[in-house]
């Protein structure tokens, strides 16, 4: 990669966490949602 | 998280294998640094392994460590021939031209 | 080969004062911003403060201001606390992906 060793950045791992977490409050969410509804 | 271990007392000359194990994230897409620090002394850059298994080292650390993956959740460190001068704590540390997930470190010991 | 020098060795200063803290790289560093800020205490591994010159890692109090490009970086500790006692290390990425250290301050907080 032309990036080399700097592909790793911070800046990207603090989107990727925003992502992970966005992703678990969803989900987490629709679960709830599927729970109340049974 | 990242861990460091096999830090022990060895003989000069003895080579030695550090283990640095993560958890929570892939080295598929993870730069790991090795990074040492002699009692009282500073921080001291090894070398780096990228998401693509490429090694990096420090001028002086070539020919004297060799970094390896070892697994997806492993990365080693080999000190080939230790000298007394390698005695210090070695850090395990995520990032590429950035450190910023930090293992406690293991203590290795040269001594006769 | 690449070599941070980083002054002074040693600042003291009292609770609420500001302390700065020099970096100086003998090549420019990736991008003209890979240098990165650490805090270390004894018995610890450092604690990632500033990434890319001036950006504040997650969770760093805004009293830590980092600043420069290329190869003159510096940190700055305002609203000193007796917390901040530590030393401080920077860190520089290369685009031929060598990275380093310099040698550290020692923060005194009287």
């Known amino acids: 990669h032309s990036d080399g060793i700097f592909t790793d950045s911070y800046s990207r791992y603090r989107k990727q966490m925003a992502v992970k977490k966005y992703l678990a409050a969803v989900l987490g969410k629709r679960y709830k949602q599927r729970v109340k509804n049974k | 998280s990242v861990e460091e271990s096999g830090g022990r007392l060895v003989t000069p000359g003895t080579p030695l294998t550090l283990t640095c194990t993560v958890s929570?994230?892939?080295?598929?897409?993870?730069?790991m640094n090795w990074v040492r620090q002699a009692p009282g002394k500073g921080l001291e850059w090894i070398g780096i392994i990228d998401n693509t298994a490429g090694t990096y080292y420090a001028p002086w650390a070539k020919g004297r460590f060799t970094i390896s993956k070892t697994s997806s959740t492993t990365v080693d460190l080999k000190m080939t021939s230790p000298t007394t001068e390698d005695t210090a704590t070695y850090f395990c540390?995520?990032?590429?031209?950035?450190?910023?997930?930090w293992g406690p470190g293991t203590l290795v010991t040269v001594s006769s | 080969a690449q070599v941070l020098t980083q002054t002074p060795s040693s600042v003291s200063a009292a609770v609420g004062g500001t302390v700065t803290i020099n970096c100086q790289s003998s090549?420019?560093?990736?991008?003209?911003?890979?240098l990165s800020w650490y805090q270390q205490k004894p018995g610890q591994p450092p604690n990632f403060l500033i990434y890319q010159a001036s950006n504040l890692a997650s969770g760093v109090p805004s009293r830590f201001k980092g600043s420069g490009s290329g190869t003159q970086f510096t940190l700055t500790i305002s609203d000193l606390e007796c917390d901040d006692a530590a030393t401080y290390y920077c860190a520089g990425g290369y685009s031929s992906n060598i990275c380093g250290f310099g040698g550290g301050t020692e923060v005194v907080v009287k």
């Open positions: 090549q420019s560093v990736h991008d003209g911003s890979y």
């Open positions: 929570g994230f892939s080295l598929s897409s993870a730069a």
């Open positions: 540390a995520r990032g590429g031209g950035e450190f910023f997930i």
